[in-house]
């Protein structure tokens, strides 16, 4: 939602968290600002304090309940407002009618672990965190592997077009240090975006056996 020079973007993690970023040109200095969430069909409402993340942008997380509780559904609409203190009052700086399941961004996958490693291949698994049961199997993943001497941006993306929480990396170099990351995205939602990348998992391939071609 954009008001003049203001941009207000929020994502739902599919369970009990709405994360918001508000940016504004000619930023207000020393002003207290909040995000207020008012669902259209729920008894609760929630507030979080916007904290600066850069010169002209602020962020906060609306914690709606216990991490794995299903606080919103596909039919909910939540009015989200940015309110900033002026004098003793609050001023509405930005507003949007937020459809949570149209604006999804899941939590980064967790519990990455090496299941099996060889000289040229490595089998890695992970888990998704705080993802709604509504998705059933309608999720996709992207993975990337950091090779020595390269950057993450240079790493080719591997796409898994189904809910598959493991991958077998092939054609790796023996006795080499790698890092691996994965991210997840539901298939649902017009403005849905990829989760953040997982924490990198470092692993090393096994050295080639001396005198043998493996």
């Amino acid at each position: 939602a954009v008001n003049g020079t203001s941009q207000f973007t929020c994502f739902y993690n599919s369970r009990a968290n709405i994360s918001c970023v508000w940016s504004q040109d000619g930023a207000l200095q020393d002003t207290s600002c909040q995000v207020h969430a008012w669902p259209d069909r729920r008894r609760w409402n929630q507030t979080c304090e916007l904290l600066p993340v850069s010169q002209a942008s602020w962020a906060c997380n609306l914690i709606l309940g216990a991490p794995d509780s299903q606080k919103l559904t596909t039919v909910d609409i939540v009015t989200l407002r940015v309110l900033c203190r002026e004098g003793v009052r609050w001023r509405v700086m930005a507003i949007q009618d937020f459809k949570p399941f149209e604006n999804l961004r899941l939590m980064a996958p967790i519990s990455l672990q090496v299941v099996h490693v060889e000289t040229h291949r490595c089998n890695i698994s992970w888990e998704i965190s705080q993802a709604s049961h509504y998705f059933e199997r309608h999720l996709e993943f992207e993975a990337r592997t950091l090779s020595p001497g390269h950057t993450w941006e240079e790493a080719p993306l591997l796409t898994l077009k189904q809910k598959q929480e493991w991958i077998c990396l092939e054609t790796l170099t023996p006795d080499t240090q790698y890092e691996f990351q994965v991210r997840v995205k539901p298939l649902q939602g017009e403005f849905t975006t990829w989760s953040p990348w997982s924490q990198p998992l470092a692993f090393r391939t096994k050295p080639a056996a001396l005198g043998k071609d493996t």
Partner: antibody, heavy 121, light 112 residues
Framework: QVQLQQSGPELVKPGASVKMSCKAS????????ISWVKQRSGQGLEWIGE????????YYNEMFKGRATLTADKSPNTAYMKLSSLTSEDSALYFC??????????????WGQGTSVTVSS | DVLMTQTPLSLPVSLGDQASISCRSS???????????LEWYLQKPGQSPKLLIY???NRFSGVPDRFSGSGSGTDFTLKISRVEAEDLGLYYC?????????FGGGTKLEIK
Amino acid sequence: QVQLQQSGPELVKPGASVKMSCKASGYRFSDYVISWVKQRSGQGLEWIGEIYPGDAQTYYNEMFKGRATLTADKSPNTAYMKLSSLTSEDSALYFCARGSYTYDNYAMDFWGQGTSVTVSS
Amino acid sequence: DVLMTQTPLSLPVSLGDQASISCRSSQNIVHSNANTYLEWYLQKPGQSPKLLIYKVSNRFSGVPDRFSGSGSGTDFTLKISRVEAEDLGLYYCFQGSHIPWTFGGGTKLEIK
């Protein structure tokens, strides 16, 4: 219906103080802001400041800072304004007015009838 | 502080005539949230002010549709399409975009 009932006229001496009241009814006192506005005879309106009774937070127009003190008491639903070190310039009609805690549309929707203050020796 | 200047100071009209009051601000009163908090209040003789118009052109509840507000940036106008006896009094513009909030000096609408 929303009503703001202000205290009666005051005749005070220069250098003295005066405290006027504004009793609210017909709405939840703690959910709205009370603003105070000054009107000198034959002149315009000046915004003095306001108080949010919910947490007693105040804000003053710099022109009135230090001489105006705004307070509120939630049990009789009453807001107060104390003016100190009075001079003839303070002779005026003082209004209280209700305002939404979130300034979404307008500053003040309902006004009291005003308290007349005359500063004279 | 934002200075609000109203013209004319006095506006003599005949009942049934159209009346137009101008209000000019010393600086742009578009708030950083893109709204313009320009309000009009009417103070009838011996009474307290009453809200007529908010956010430039929105009529407050119960205000007759003969009252209309317009303008943008620094120039604003209140129009009364057919003046009635009950419309006589002092009209004030007010800006609520920049603290401290300020009123115009007032325009007296009176019978010609």
